[in-house]
């Protein structure tokens, strides 16, 4: 009786169940009753992810330079090229198929997490107590200087953008 | 016990034809491919051709293709090999064997084809 | 056609001793591999089939190994039984092939 189903990594074809070609593998032929599943190995530059049937191998994928992009990891027989942006940028989407540049955090704003190449930069408000008088992707918010640590005295007060100004203690005549 | 017997086998002219059958018995032929692989004296195995349990498919070395044809009755749990234009090169023992997931587990006990004028 | 070529054509051992019979095909075949004893005037009989799977009723003395374009068929402990000629067929794509025979004869 002929299978109406296979195995797992098998394929009906003919009434008959056939092996499929391993990752790293493209089929050349179909099975018989007399032969297994022909298979060869993609070419280079080309790769198969899966178990396949597939008579041709996918290309590797190219980081294209002038898009920011550049190769994270080398596409194998049995896997794609994983491409990343350059310093500076970051991927758009998880399979990051453009750059776009880091973000700036404004000032009054600190740098929560630095971007990576996947993912933008994480500003945060600078709590009380706390400052950044730049633009920057990677500063984070500073703490005031604490006056009191060098005998001085607060003379104009913090704010989310600037700092304290210290100044000397009034001396008592 | 599976059983494979082969016959019509003798001396033929080239040019000639001949036509071996393979009675089988013992198993469910239906569900079985077969094959047929000769030896020429003195010499070694050479796969000839195949034919799938439902006759579907068949398959022929390229040295025997257009000349040969495989077929089955399984009615009659019979294989045969229709030889035509014969040639002195096909001199050999032909032997039926029974497939079972790509290899050949029963073989018969061969008969003797002599291509010669 | 993949081509079949086995090592040594033939090989004169004695009972007991340690046989090794190689196979070698002209592409990659996987473990698609099989291998036969025939006795003169006797049909072949399966003794191994996908490279190292041992027939029912084929004695443990016999075991086979390989994958790819090299294979060996191992006889642990010759038999006098055991003196007969041994062919590879592969099956990795068609036509099936065999190779030309290893012919194992007393020493």
């Known amino acids: 009786e002929p299978p109406t189903a296979c195995r797992e990594k098998q394929y009906l074809i003919n009434s008959q169940c056939c092996s499929l070609c391993q990752p790293g593998q493209k089929l050349v032929s179909d099975c018989t009753e007399f032969t297994e599943t022909e298979c060869l190995p993609c070419d280079s530059g080309e790769f198969s992810a899966q178990w396949n049937r597939e008579i041709r191998c996918h290309q590797h994928r190219h980081c294209e330079p002038n898009q920011g992009l550049r190769v994270k990891k080398e596409g194998t027989a049995e896997s794609d090229t994983v491409c990343t942006c350059e310093e500076g940028w970051h991927c758009t989407s998880e399979a990051c198929e453009s750059c776009v540049l880091h973000r700036s955090c404004s000032p009054g704003f600190g740098v929560k997490q630095i971007a990576t190449g996947v993912s933008d930069t994480i500003c945060e408000p600078c709590p009380v107590g706390f400052f950044s008088n730049v633009s920057s992707a990677f500063e984070k918010c500073h703490p005031w200087t604490s006056c009191e640590t060098k005998d001085l005295v607060v003379q104009q007060a913090g704010t989310n953008k600037t700092d304290v100004v210290c100044g000397p203690q009034d001396r008592l005549r | 016990e599976v059983q494979l017997l082969e016959s019509g086998g003798g001396l033929v002219q080239p040019g000639g034809s001949l036509r071996l059958s393979c009675a089988a018995s013992g198993f469910t032929f239906s569900s079985y491919a077969m094959s047929w692989v000769r030896q020429a004296p003195g010499k070694g195995l050479e796969w000839v051709s195949g034919i799938g349990g439902s006759s579907s498919y068949t398959s022929y070395a390229d040295s025997v293709k257009g000349r040969f044809t495989i077929s089955r009755d399984n009615s009659k749990n019979t294989l045969y090999l229709q030889m035509n234009s014969l040639r002195a090169e096909d001199t050999a023992v032909y032997y039926c064997?029974?497939?079972?997931?790509?290899?050949?587990?029963?073989w018969g006990q061969g008969t003797l084809v002599t291509v010669s004028s | 056609d993949i081509q079949m070529t086995q090592s040594p054509s033939s090989l004169s051992a004695s009972v007991g001793d340690h046989v090794t019979i190689t196979c070698r095909a002209s592409?990659?075949?996987?473990?698609?591999l099989n291998w036969y004893q025939q006795k003169p005037g006797k049909a072949p009989k399966l003794l191994i089939y996908a490279a190292s799977s041992l027939q029912s009723g084929v004695p443990s003395r016999f075991s086979g190994s390989g994958s790819g374009t090299d294979f060996t068929l191992t006889i642990s402990s010759l038999q006098p039984e055991d003196f007969a000629t041994y062919y590879c067929q592969q099956y990795g794509s068609a036509p099936p092939t065999f190779g030309q025979g290893t012919k194992l004869e007393i020493k």
């Open positions: 592409q990659s075949i996987s473990s698609y």
């Open positions: 064997a029974r497939y079972y997931s790509y290899h050949m587990d029963y």
